[in-house]
Interface confidence: low
Amino acid sequence: IFPLAFFIYVPMNEQIVIGRLDEDIILPSSFERGSEVVIHWKYQDSYKVHSYYKGSDHLESQDPRYANRTSLFYNEIQNGNASLFFRRVSLLDEGIYTCYVGTAIQVITNKVVLKVGVFLTPVMKYEKRNTNSFLICSVLSVYPRPIITWKMDNTPISENNMEETGSLDSFSINSPLNITGSNSSYECTIENSLLKQTWTGRWTMKDGLHKMQSEHVSLSCQPVNDYFSPNQDFKVTWSRMKSGTFSVLAYYLSSSQNTIINESRFSWNKELINQSDFSMNLMDLNLSDSGEYLCNISSDEYTLLTIHTVHVEPSQETASHN
């Protein structure tokens, strides 16, 4: 319709889009309205992602990896919107996408760089290995490689072991810290710089408690305000360590405000819970109740671990009977 000389070649534009694994994203592209619209999306300048012309999609040559995963905003094409809706992105989708748009008066080429990140909620675990005590910060699936930092009593620790397993699409990372014999508080931060997402794990050891048999013990567990947001879903778990493994005494889910108690002598104060105080009582203590008690408050953004050591001693009566 128009001689080639009238075509306007606009310099390449480049945008960066950050997507999250398995979620849907939009690769943006806009153009000046015109008739006879042709839209071609290509990956790395060779793989056909999506083609549209003569008023409809033409996907005969679409690369199989994009089958049923792409669509345009058909009602907005006449308004100059050539953006691509992209379903269920994977790490293999990372790279440069080129959008070629031709109309009767103009040809433009836009470049979009797609970066994909993964950040499955990390966890902080407290483990006993023989006579040693370890804190382990771990994340099952993360991409790109995260930044992990440890602090002891709010002071950064340079020693930082990282056990890393790389798979095709992400990393699995464990960062253990030996805290044997320490009464300090510890903090571990895992940061995904691409997704601008940070998770923090905090561990605090409370002073040991000495109790007599048949007495009751009250163990405190209150979140640190810096991390805690009562509007965000979280879970509180109280557990007791016996012979190296933790058994769950009770847990609370904020989403349903449900409390599940597995130990009949355990009690939680509903009013305190409403004030975000998860301290617990354990009644009628016996000698086998001696050990470590762990309160775990966890959300998508943090894990707060509070540990109490309880020593239950025989009462005078029991001692005199023996």
Partner: antibody, heavy 120, light 107 residues
Framework: QVQLVESGGGVVQPGRSLRLSCAAS????????MHWVRQVPGKGLEWVAV????????DYADSVKGRFTISRDNSKNTLYLQMNSLRVEDTAVYYC?????????????WGQGTLVTVSS | DIQMTQSPSSLSASVGDRVTITCRAS??????LAWYQQKPGKVPKLLIY???TLQSGVPSRFSGSGSGTDFTLTISSLQPEDVATYYC?????????FGPGTKVDIK
């Protein structure tokens, strides 16, 4: 309706060349991927080559790679197969075939075929 | 390259019989599989694509199933006009190989 008409077949000596053509009509040729598939009379189908709708991508069976070239002229609605260094085992009926509209590399229409005989 | 195999290579069945043809890929191909019918002296005809989607105009007695490496073409009630050779074809990536074919005739 879709019509695919192959031509250019015949008897040729080993080592020589032949060019097959396929004239397409009844559909928008430039919108569809096209294939060449061959069949030794009385035997099975063998996929030979494919070309994308805009000619930007081509793929070949290992048995013909480096010897055969698929091409198209969208302005003439014609598909081609340039066959060089022909071998006796290239003897077959050569079909031109069109992609199904919503498909990826499988065909919904076939030509009647043209016979290529490679013999000394 | 991925190899395609079909079984049986030929079969005879009576009119009205249920007939099953199997196609196996040497590696997973998701559901990128098509089935074709070629009657004697005719060109092939597309029956099924995407492993189980019936091409328009194909009788409903034909059905396809499977995903990954194992696929099946079933004719629920064999008719005289179904005498033909049946081919499977993978189309996930080049080369877009056909199976060796299964010849079906009437007892």
């Amino acid at each position: 309706q879709v019509q695919l008409v192959e031509s250019g077949g015949g008897v040729v000596q080993p080592g020589r060349s032949l060019r097959l053509s396929c004239a397409a009509s009844g559909f928008t040729f430039s919108n569809y991927g096209m294939h060449w598939v061959r069949q030794v009379p009385g035997k099975g189908l063998e996929w030979v080559a494919v070309i994308w709708y805009d000619g930007s991508e081509k793929d070949y069976a290992d048995s013909v790679k480096g010897r055969f070239t698929i091409s198209r002229d969208n302005s003439k609605n014609t598909l081609y197969l340039q066959m060089n260094s022909l071998r006796v085992e290239d003897t077959a009926v050569y079909y031109c075939a069109k992609d199904l509209i919503s498909g990826i590399y499988y065909v919904d229409h076939w030509g009647q075929g043209t016979l290529v005989t490679v013999s000394s | 390259d991925i190899q395609m195999t079909q079984s049986p290579s030929s079969l005879s069945a009576s009119v009205g019989d249920r007939v099953t043809i199997t196609c196996r890929a040497s590696q997973g191909i998701s559901n990128y599989l098509a089935w074709y019918q070629q009657k004697p002296g005719k060109v092939p005809k597309l029956l099924i694509y995407a492993a189980s989607t019936l091409q328009s105009g194909v009788p409903s007695r034909f059905s396809g199933s499977g995903s990954g490496t194992d696929f099946t073409l079933t004719i629920s009630s064999l008719q005289p006009e179904d005498v033909a050779t049946y081919y499977c074809q993978k189309y996930n990536s080049a080369p877009f190989t056909f199976g060796p074919g299964t010849k079906v005739d009437i007892k």
